[in-house]
């Protein structure tokens, strides 16, 4: 019925409007409403226009696409011509009573399907389903997928390309890991991956100063160290380095009229020359302070050597040996002095004897036929040596003796002229001065080392060398190496050394063959009153702590790996220091300070005495241990 | 008051292994270090094993050494003594004990179990 | 390994009277030195430790002394529950070691 009225509509319009020209109201008449007739009038004088002979050629622009004037007028009630649909975006064009609706295909929108839908923006489909990346197109969308991304057969979702097993050799010798959208080249910590190269080259750290002092780079790594002689340790960073604490301060306060016996390791540290009238004899008195069993007081003799007497101390008693022109003689006798103690000790020569006193009651009284020294020109000239011998006597002593004492004397007065001029020798150089209190034991003041040649060998022992240790140690610093054996090369086979812990207040005992740490005793308080114990034993199988301590260790099979490293030094020469390391690299030891505090060591058995050692620091005391500072009210 | 209470003991031909389990209570089992001591029947205290508070070092006497085996499960405050090739001479109670101090040194004994018998016998 | 020796192995003393323990080291054990009491079918219970310092809950007639390799136990006046074996016991080094023990009984 609605086309029949359309055909109708058309022909009236045929009619009245073409075959002849028709106005407004005549037009009313065809269409029978205003608003069809409102459009369509203005139009139809434009198709006149364009069409009626002689008009301007810009007229017919907007009617272009008609031949003719039936053309242009039949398509004035059509909406839908000229199409106003956007051409891309509409589906179909409905034309109404001076309107049209355009029906839009998926994916546009708009009266005239003139918008494209972004379906990558519908908050209802988030992404557009797209697991990557959602691109927008006009009318429509699709999605791909990153670099190293396949997309799979649903068009939406993207699978990862394992890059590593599609070219194996994509890294070289470095490991290829996949990972997603790409790989990576992956090195051991340590090392950087060569892109040229494809190889993984070790990264050298010590190039990019990461150590504060020293730093020794090796493949794969690095490691700083401190320079422990110059007391300084590495800090808990690993990195930066700083000074090595006292933990215990040690009363080191001296007295200019004390004289320090054990200046020098070898020598004599004081000497004297005695111009007397004939008559004079000999005598010595002086108050005497030492723990060493063994040393000399002092040693006298005639300006030509041929008459000498010796002052000495041998098992911890008073020794005179004496050799003139008349006698040879050696007496030992008397209490053991070697108290720590002050004794006060006289040798005087009487007309016919020497008489040796302590505490002023006589202990000793040897006969002599004739002078001591024998006075030439009516002058008696004598040569007065402490703590040592002017030069090698040794074959011409009654028995040898080593004459190393480490002890004091005060309230001297020789050949009955006292003290005068030597005080002021004395005042003047303070390592000479003796400390004022002191204890038993022996002193390391964290600035030298003491070396011995130890056999370890032990030719009935079917494990071959054996080294059982026993250290009693009272530390005053927390850092520091107590014993180490190193060999001809310059490596440290073996060593014990104390660190300060991270517990706060406390010291690990490190025990290390090389630069590897085997054993840590863990979180002692060391720095302490007491003295504190060690006890260990070592042969080629086995380290094995025998005080019941709590200790960290390496694996077994690393242990014995260790021990065939020291196995090995051991069958070579090593020489064994005690407070610290010789001249040997920061990095053969994991600890290079030297030890600072008192230390007595037991090496298979035997009680090292300093005084027997190689070489001696003269700033190690072998028999005196200053005592713990206690704070007093004023201090 | 520590309660130290041990298990596990009876009779095991000579050859055989046993398991004994001490169970601790009433103090901090982790912190400290301990111990199984054993008495013969008739004889003094010998002292067997030790070990530290985590489990991590051993200790054993030169007549035990390769056969018994110390050791703990701090989760459930447990300390194990595991015996095996038992001979006769091993017959003894065997007390566990706990040591004196923690921290870094192995100590005397402060508690004792009341101990469990181990006989070897045919 | 240390040693530990231990006299009298039985002592006999009237309750109320004195009694003295004797303990000796092989080697040196410095102070590390413990004094255990134990009575008929029970488990040992220690009485001091340092050699002379006396563990919580022990009276004060029980005492110790000495250092190195010589120590001492003495109980100042025995009551009816002292009667027991004593054992004395180093914790110097591994292995820890104790003495055969002394068995205090009533005379």
């Known amino acids: 019925a609605n086309s029949m009225l359309e055909e109708t509509k058309q022909g009236n319009l045929e009619r009245e409007c073409i075959e002849e020209l028709c106005n407004k109201e005549e037009a009313r008449e065809v269409f029978e409403n205003d608003p069809e007739t409102d459009y369509f009038y203005p139009k139809y004088l434009v198709c006149l226009r364009s069409f009626q002979s002689g008009l301007f050629t810009a007229a017919r622009q907007s009617t272009d696409a008609y031949p003719d004037l039936r053309s242009c007028v039949n398509a004035i009630p059509d909406q839908c011509s000229p199409l106003p649909c956007n051409e891309d975006g509409y589906m179909s064009c409905k034309d109404g009573k001076a309107s049209f609706t355009c029906t839009c295909k998926p994916g546009w929108q708009g009266e005239k399907c003139e918008f494209d839908i972004n379906e990558c923006k519908d908050p209802s489909n988030i992404n557009g389903g797209c697991s990557q990346i959602c691109d927008n197109t006009p009318g429509s969308y699709h999605c791909s997928c990153k670099s190293g991304f396949v997309m799979l057969s649903n068009k939406k979702d993207c699978k990862d390309v394992d890059e590593c097993s599609l070219k194996p050799n994509m890294c070289g010798t470095a490991v290829c890991k996949n990972i997603p959208g790409d790989f990576e080249c992956e090195c051991p910590e340590g090392y950087r991956y060569n892109l040229k190269s494809k190889s993984c080259e070790d990264v050298d750290e010590c190039s990019e100063n990461m150590c504060a002092q020293l730093c020794v780079n090796y493949p794969g790594g690095y490691t700083c160290y401190c320079d422990g002689k110059k007391g300084f340790k590495l800090a808990q960073d690993q990195k930066s380095c700083e000074a090595v604490s006292v933990c215990l301060p040690l009363n080191l306060d001296t007295k200019y009229e004390l004289l320090y016996l054990a200046e020098q390791f070898a020598g004599v540290v004081l000497y004297l020359k005695f111009r007397l009238p004939e008559i004079s004899r000999f005598s010595a008195e002086f108050d005497f302070r030492t723990y060493d069993s063994q040393g000399v007081i002092l040693y006298a003799e005639s300006i030509d050597h041929s008459a000498w007497l010796l002052i000495a101390l041998r098992g911890g008693k008073i020794e005179v040996q004496l050799k003139n022109e008349h006698t040879s003689k050696i007496t030992t006798g008397g209490d053991i002095i070697n108290n720590g103690l002050w004794n006060m000790v006289s040798v005087e020569e009487l007309e016919h004897s020497i008489s040796i006193k302590i505490a002023k009651e006589a202990v000793m009284d040897i006969n002599k036929p004739g002078p001591l020294f024998k006075p030439e020109n009516g002058l008696l000239e004598t040569k007065v040596y402490f703590a040592g011998f002017p030069r090698k006597v040794e074959s011409e002593l009654i028995k040898p003796i080593n004459p190393r004492l480490d002890g004091c004397i005060r309230s001297w007065n020789l050949m009955k002229q006292g003290a005068s001029g030597i005080k002021e020798i004395i005042q003047e150089k303070q390592n000479k001065h003796c400390l004022v209190t002191v204890e038993k034991g022996s002193y390391y003041p964290g600035s030298g080392i003491a070396e011995f040649h130890i056999d370890y060998n032990n030719g009935s022992n079917a494990e071959g060398w054996h080294i059982n240790v026993t250290l009693n140690i009272r530390p005053s610093m927390g850092t520091g190496v107590m014993l180490a054996l190193v060999s001809s090369n310059n490596t440290v086979p073996f060593a014990v050394s104390l660190v300060d812990s991270t517990s706060e207040k406390s010291q690990d005992i490190v025990i290390s063959v090389e630069n590897t740490v085997i054993y840590r005793i863990q979180a002692l308080s060391l720095c302490s009153n007491q003295r504190s114990h060690l006890e260990f034993r070592v042969n080629r199988n086995n380290l094995e702590l025998l005080t019941p301590l709590k200790i960290e260790t390496i694996s077994q099979e690393e242990l014995q790996t260790q021990l065939a490293i020291l196995d090995k030094a051991m069958k070579g020469k090593v020489a064994t220091y005690l407070g610290g390391l010789p001249d040997v690299p920061f990095s053969a030891t994991p600890v290079n300070a030297f030890y600072n505090g008192c230390m007595e060591v037991n090496i298979n058995g035997v009680e090292l005495d300093l005084d027997e050692a190689i070489s001696k620091h003269n700033d190690i005391r072998a028999h005196s241990c200053p005592s713990v500072w206690k704070k007093t009210k004023n201090s | 008051e520590v309660q130290l209470l041990e298990s596990g003991g009876g009779l095991v031909q000579p050859g055989g292994s046993l398991r004994l389990s001490c169970a601790a209570s009433r103090f901090s089992f982790s912190s400290y270090a301990m111990s199984w001591v054993r008495q013969a029947p008739g004889k003094g205290l010998e002292w067997v094993s030790a070990i530290s508070d985590s489990g991590s070092n051993t200790y054993y006497a030169d007549s035990v050494k390769g056969l018994f085996t110390i050791s703990r499960d701090n989760s459930k405050n447990t300390l194990y003594l595991q015996m095996n090739s038992l001979r006769a001479e091993d017959t003894a109670v065997y007390y566990c004990?706990?040591?004196?101090?923690?921290?870094?040194?192995?100590?005397?004994?402060?508690?004792w179990g009341q101990g469990t018998l181990v006989t070897v016998s045919t | 390994e240390i040693v530990m020796t231990q006299s009298p192995a039985t002592l006999s003393v009237f309750p109320g009277e004195r009694a003295t323990l004797s303990c000796r080291a092989s080697q040196s054990v410095r102070s590390n030195l413990a004094w255990h009491q134990q009575k008929l079918g029970q488990a040992p219970r220690l009485l001091l430790y340092g050699a002379s310092t006396r563990a919580t809950g022990i009276p004060a007639r029980f005492s110790g002394s000495g250092s190195g390799t010589e120590f001492t136990l003495a109980i100042s006046s025995l009551q009816s529950e002292d009667f027991a074996v004593y054992y004395c016991?180093?914790?110097?080094?591994?292995?820890?070691?104790f003495g055969g023990g002394t068995k205090v009984g009533i005379k």
């Open positions: 004990a706990k040591n004196y101090e923690s921290g870094g040194y192995y100590t005397f004994f402060d508690y």
């Open positions: 016991q180093q914790y110097n080094s591994w292995p820890f070691t």
